[in-house]
């Protein structure tokens, strides 16, 4: 069907809606996908949990924003904030960033299309 | 080598309607975002519209939005933009251009520019 | 009045440095990619930068494009007198749902 788009809503809204929800089971599965269980990550303990729940618990999580599709780009962005600051080298910024990048399509979402997730300045 | 060229400006009345196109050559058309952008004399860049691969997507200017309508030829290799209800500041160069844009993870970005079309808006 | 915030003009001497900057806020610049584009007197805009920092085949390295928070810069070293020309910046606005261009900087080499 053709659609022609207006106007998606405002960002400060979407950055409301990120506010409210639970972004924690988002960053341990990612965390989990590319740390493994490797006993260095152990500032949430990722191993009590599967990372098939974790999955589910972060697109529940992400499914209770109103606007879940509009959002996503913000949700993405505040989940690569957050962990910014534990990523140890270049090389786990681009594995976490990979996998971030994943997760709208694990969750059954459309991926973003214009988002940039490089949100830190240059700190990841 | 990758050519645009845009057709169709000329002088209107305000109030008047001109359909500009624009013949694009040497990459596969169909593959790629289109955009109108334009130039007032003397004036910045103002994008204008975007229009997705399949014309299934449209984006507009505020102030062209129910005056201006994008649509592409993918087997004429053609974009076209049919401007009614014409204002004198609607007067600017109009380019076509070719969008990078992806379905994911990137930006708009116009890479490759016509050589612009004059439309003059005047009584 | 553009929604981002370019100088009107830069000037610098033949094989220095310059930058320009585009100030912008967190549904444009903040959330999405910057590019940037030379315009030569009398002819149509020419792509430098995309994606905040990537530069297109052709486009020598003495350009540059970063981006920080809400604001993006074009750095330019070994400035020439071809450089002379005017620099735009663009992105995506989320809430205008729409792409938009900075003023325009005029870049004039002393």
């Known amino acids: 069907m053709r659609r022609e788009r207006g106007r998606q809503g405002d960002s400060s809204s979407c950055e409301r809606q990120v506010d409210r929800v639970n972004l924690k089971p988002c960053e341990q599965h990612i965390m989990q996908r590319i740390m493994g269980e490797q006993e260095q990550y152990d500032s949430y303990d990722i191993r009590s949990t599967r990372s098939s729940d974790q999955q589910q618990r972060c697109c529940d999580e992400l499914n209770e924003m109103e606007n879940t599709q509009r959002c996503m780009c913000e949700a993405l962005q505040q989940i690569m904030e957050n962990q910014c600051d534990r990523l140890q080298d270049r090389q786990m910024v681009q594995q976490f960033k990979r996998e971030l990048m994943n997760l709208p399509q694990q969750c059954n979402f459309r991926a973003p299309q214009r988002c940039d997730l490089d949100v830190s300045g240059g700190r990841c | 080598e990758v050519q645009l060229v845009e057709s169709g400006g000329g002088l209107v009345q305000p109030g008047g309607s001109l359909r500009l196109s624009c013949a694009a050559s040497?990459?596969?058309?169909?593959?790629?975002?289109m955009t109108w952008v334009r130039q007032a004399p003397g004036k910045g860049l103002e994008w204008v519209a975007n229009?997705?691969?399949?014309?299934?997507?449209?984006d507009y200017l505020d102030s062209v939005r129910g005056r201006f309508t994008i649509s592409r030829d993918n087997a004429k290799n053609s974009l076209y933009l049919q401007m009614n209800s014409l204002r004198a500041e609607d007067t600017a160069v109009y380019y076509c251009?070719?969008?990078?844009?992806?379905?994911?993870?990137?930006?708009?970005?116009?890479?490759?520019w016509g050589q612009g079309t004059l439309v003059t808006v005047s009584s | 009045q553009s929604v981002l915030t370019q100088p009107p003009s830069v000037s610098a001497a033949p094989g220095q440095k310059v930058t320009i900057s585009c100030s912008g806020t967190?549904?444009?610049?903040?959330?999405?990619?910057v590019s940037w584009y030379q315009q030569l007197p009398g002819t149509a805009p020419k792509l430098l930068i995309y994606?905040?920092?990537k530069r297109p085949s052709g486009i020598p390295d003495r350009f540059s494009g970063s981006k920080s928070g809400t604001s993006a810069t074009l750095g330019i070293t070994g400035l020439q007198t071809g450089d002379e020309a005017d620099y735009y910046c663009?992105?995506?606005?989320?809430?205008?749902?729409?792409?938009?261009f900075g003023g325009g900087t005029k870049l004039t080499v002393l």
């Open positions: 251009t070719r969008n990078g844009l992806q379905d994911s993870y990137s930006g708009d970005f116009f890479d490759h």
């Open positions: 040497g990459f596969k058309f169909s593959t790629f975002y």
């Open positions: 229009i997705k691969q399949d014309g299934s997507e449209k």
């Open positions: 967190g549904s444009n610049i903040g959330h999405n990619y």
């Open positions: 994606d905040n920092t």
């Open positions: 663009a992105t995506w606005d989320a809430d205008l749902s729409a792409v938009l």
